[in-house]
């Protein structure tokens, strides 16, 4: 089902431990994350916020497969967590460290 | 050659003809669009500016690639192009068409 | 405006489970953590847990084996759980909203655990 | 795993400085945070310092925190106290054991 398997946002939960990141993440022990998984077909959907370049690049790759790669579906904005971490043996409190979910994802 | 495969620019020619657009590109008949290609594997290089997401996401992938996909190798920043176009009938002159051409790849 | 009520029972038998749910509104679970916290009768201030904005979960290793905390985004609530309960975990148990700083809390529910 | 050790009660008259101490058991007091907490009787605490210094919008400036290294302590001082200071005064740090650790509370009478 290609609709099925089109760029969207599913769920991904980081295990800090998973990834050695205890070692200076005391808090939480992991989080939901997501991740964008899917294809990038031509035509791209507005809700995927497709730049011209995407959009180009995808119609070429539709065209000639050979000439150029699919655009790909990757977060298009990403939201901060809470988090208490080891900062030069201090532990510290941030409210809001950045760039760490996923909120939307799009083809670029 | 892992680093040759390594996540980068690379030229893309987009002939405005063979997508259709010259029905309403008047000029140029194409342009040099470059596409980013290649493989973001941990650890992510500091050039193609990974979000913290990325990292976790090529970490986990590399601890457990069914777990998580690769992060993706994307234009980070687009630059415009300027067109001659035809709006409603009247030939007109864009002198910045925006994000139209890659001009950095990064891994997202 | 930002509001944390706690709802669940006055009394609990010896050896039952305790439940309570912290409703919020005028912030997402998303964006804020929430702490439980609870005072015995005339004593001190004991953090439980807290449910984290990325919906990881932290608990107090003297609770870990017999609390669960857990959320309904969609609600706005966070619920706590806490099995096996004898006479000393009598206390008021608070949810507070913890952004830059602990900011709000709610009133507290008084639970007396008695047969 | 270490603990905040607070007096149990304080006095002070209206008008005076008082200084309340939070003693960090093991362990370095600087090595994070204290918060401060006030609590009156049968209320929800509210928070009057922050990162050890720092007031929250609305706290009184003559609610002020810091610390001394060398006798391992946290201190919230207030100036030219208030009738409607007297309440149960928790210090709060962390730890990587148990996350959020609490003062067993200091009740400061206001004379």
């Known amino acids: 089902n290609a609709k099925g398997n089109y760029c969207k946002r599913t769920p991904l939960y980081i295990d800090f431990k998973e990834i050695g990141w205890d070692s200076w993440i005391i808090a939480p022990p992991g989080y939901e994350a997501y991740e964008c998984r899917g294809v990038c077909n031509y035509p791209l959907a507005e809700h995927l916020t497709p730049t011209k370049h995407a959009i180009i690049q995808a119609l070429v790759h539709l065209k000639n497969s050979q000439k150029a790669s699919k655009a790909c579906c990757v977060p298009t904005k990403l939201e901060p967590i809470s988090i208490l971490y080891l900062d030069k043996g201090v532990v510290t409190y941030k409210f809001k460290y950045e760039g760490m979910a996923v909120s939307e994802c799009g083809c670029r | 050659n892992a680093k040759g495969n390594y996540c980068k620019r690379t030229p893309l020619y987009i002939d405005f003809k063979e997508i259709g657009w010259d029905s309403w590109i008047i000029a140029p008949p194409g342009y040099e669009a470059y596409e980013c290609r290649g493989v973001c594997n941990y650890p992510l290089a500091e050039h193609l500016t990974p979000t913290k997401h990325a990292i976790i996401q090529a970490l986990v992938h590399l601890k457990n690639s069914q777990k998580a996909s690769k992060a993706c190798c994307v234009p980070t920043k687009l630059e415009p192009i300027s067109i001659l176009y035809l709006d409603k009938g009247v030939v007109t002159y864009k002198f910045k068409y925006e994000g139209m051409a890659v001009s950095e790849c990064g891994c997202r | 405006q930002v509001q944390l009520k706690e709802t669940g029972p006055d009394l609990v038998q010896p050896t039952q489970t305790l439940d309570i749910t912290c409703t919020v509104s005028?912030?997402?679970?998303?964006?804020?953590?929430v702490h439980w916290v609870r005072q015995p009768p005339g004593k001190g201030l004991e953090w439980m847990g807290t449910m984290w904005n990325g919906g990881g979960i932290d608990y107090n290793s003297a609770f870990k084996s017999r609390l669960a905390i857990s959320r309904d985004t969609s609600k706005s609530e966070v619920f706590l759980k806490m099995d096996s309960l004898q006479t000393d975990d009598t206390a008021k148990y608070f949810c507070?909203?913890?952004?830059?700083?602990?900011?709000?809390w709610g009133q507290g529910i008084m639970v007396t655990v008695s047969s | 795993q270490f603990a905040l050790i607070q007096s149990d009660s304080m006095s002070t008259s209206a008008g005076s400085t008082v200084k309340l101490s939070c003693k960090r058991s093991t362990g370095n007091i600087g090595s994070s945070y204290v918060y401060w907490y006030q609590q009156h009787e049968g209320r929800s605490p509210t928070t009057m310092i922050y990162d050890g210094d720092k007031r929250p919008d609305g706290v009184p400036d003559r609610f002020s925190g810091s610390i001394d290294s060398s006798s391992n302590s946290a201190f919230l001082t207030i100036n030219d106290v208030q009738i409607e200071d007297e309440a149960v005064y928790f210090c709060?740090?962390?730890?990587?054991?148990?996350?959020?650790?609490f003062g067993g509370g200091t009740k400061l009478t206001v004379l």
């Open positions: 709060q740090s962390f730890s990587s054991g148990i996350k959020f650790i």
């Open positions: 005028g912030f997402s679970l998303t964006t804020y953590n």
């Open positions: 507070a909203r913890l952004g830059y700083y602990v900011d709000y």
